[in-house]
């Protein structure tokens, strides 16, 4: 099941995933002047079995000038200018991306892809935070957030990271060992009578993906 909301925003910090849990989707968006090929995939999907995970579907972009069919109400405008993104979901290779079972690595770039990658995370996904350039971690508990299913609703745990305005940056896991948090997790990890297992999640995704992907948002 896809997470209902985005990971928490931490002032002066950004986040990224080191690897993507099976079921994660990535928009097949194209840069200015290009668009998804007709009948092309809307998303790449992280799928796999017990031994190997990989991205299904290929994102393909074609020049907008070659397009001869449209569903527009009004004429399509010129493609927007490329804009820099401050979000960590942009294309970048994590420093240390171990092969986690049931996870996909960062997909390689495709020709003429958009400047920002938009991922749709599933329950169980973990993202890691670091302070932006010019800020440092003042207090360091677990600098990660996990999407969890609690009482039938998804939520992200709150990362214990405070970034202060000093010319020093914190690092991603693998570059610096995080300090142990004295208080541990900020919220109690209460379990519910009804939970959704990873197996159920993946089975439901597989069953609904083919028929519902165009009209249903997995959120």
């Amino acid at each position: 099941e896809l997470c209902d909301d985005d990971p928490p925003e931490i002032p002066h910090a950004t986040f990224k995933a080191m690897a993507y849990k099976e079921g994660t989707m990535l928009n097949c968006e194209c840069k200015r002047g290009f668009r998804r090929i007709k009948s092309g995939s809307l998303y790449m999907l992280c799928t796999g079995n017990s031994s190997h995970s990989s991205w299904d579907n290929q994102c393909q972009c074609t020049s907008s000038a070659t397009r001869n069919t449209t569903k527009q109400v009004t004429p399509q405008p010129e493609e927007q200018k490329e804009r820099k993104t401050t979000e960590m979901q942009s294309p970048m290779q994590p420093v240390d991306q171990a092969s986690l079972p049931g996870h996909c690595r960062e997909p390689p770039p495709w020709e003429n892809e958009a400047t920002e990658r938009i991922y749709h995370f599933v329950v169980g996904q973990m993202v890691y935070y670091q302070c932006v350039q010019g800020y440092r971690a003042l207090h360091r508990g677990p600098a990660e957030s996990v999407c969890k299913m609690t009482h039938g609703k998804t939520r992200w745990t709150q990362p214990q990271l405070i970034c202060t305005g000093e010319m020093e940056t914190s690092q991603f896991p693998g570059e610096e060992k995080p300090q142990a948090s004295p208080e541990g997790r900020p919220e109690s990890e209460t379990s519910c009578l009804v939970t959704t297992t990873d197996f159920q999640i993946q089975t439901e995704m597989a069953a609904t993906m083919e028929t519902s992907i165009f009209t249903t948002e997995y959120q």
């Epitope: 209902d4 194209c30 200015r32 907008s64 569903k71 927007q80 165009f214 948002e217 959120q219």
Partner: nanobody, 123 residues
Framework: EVQLLESGGGLVQPGGSLRVSCAAS????????MGWFRQAPGKEREFVAA????????RYADSVKGRFTISRDNAKNTVYLQMNSLRPEDTAVYYC????????????????WGQGTQVTVSS
């Protein structure tokens, strides 16, 4: 026929607020993503905000973060853009658009467009 009809534009003073609406008709309101774009005179159309089908996830252009809020009412087949702390540089025609993508921020990802509503910020 698919129709996206924007309304609520007008003249507002700097620092003021305005809410524009987009009513969808001609097809069930089942697009994965709805978005707002704007185009100022002599400039290219640019992304403003996007919202997921459930309304639980949103995306904003850096220039409007903290000032604009996108929301949707699926029961009314309507998406809204609440604009606060308006600035003269927000003056533009605001367009509503629909996409099969979730939370798309690129223009090419949107296939359905409204005619636009003019928002002018001036004293």
């Amino acid at each position: 026929e698919v129709q996206l009809l924007e309304s609520g534009g007008g003249l507002v003073q700097p620092g003021g607020s305005l809410r524009v609406s987009c009513a969808a008709s001609g097809r069930t309101f089942s697009w994965n993503g709805m978005g707002w774009f704007r185009q100022a005179p002599g400039k290219e159309r640019e992304f403003v905000a996007a919202i997921s089908q459930s309304g639980g996830r949103t995306r904003y252009a850096d220039s409007v973060k903290g000032r604009f809020t996108i929301s949707r009412d699926n029961a009314k087949n309507t998406v809204y853009l609440q604009m606060n702390s308006l600035r003269p540089e927000d003056t533009a025609v605001y367009y509503c658009a629909a996409s099969d993508f979730l939370l798309a921020t690129t223009i090419s990802a949107y296939d359905y467009w409204g005619q636009g509503t003019q928002v002018t910020v001036s004293s």
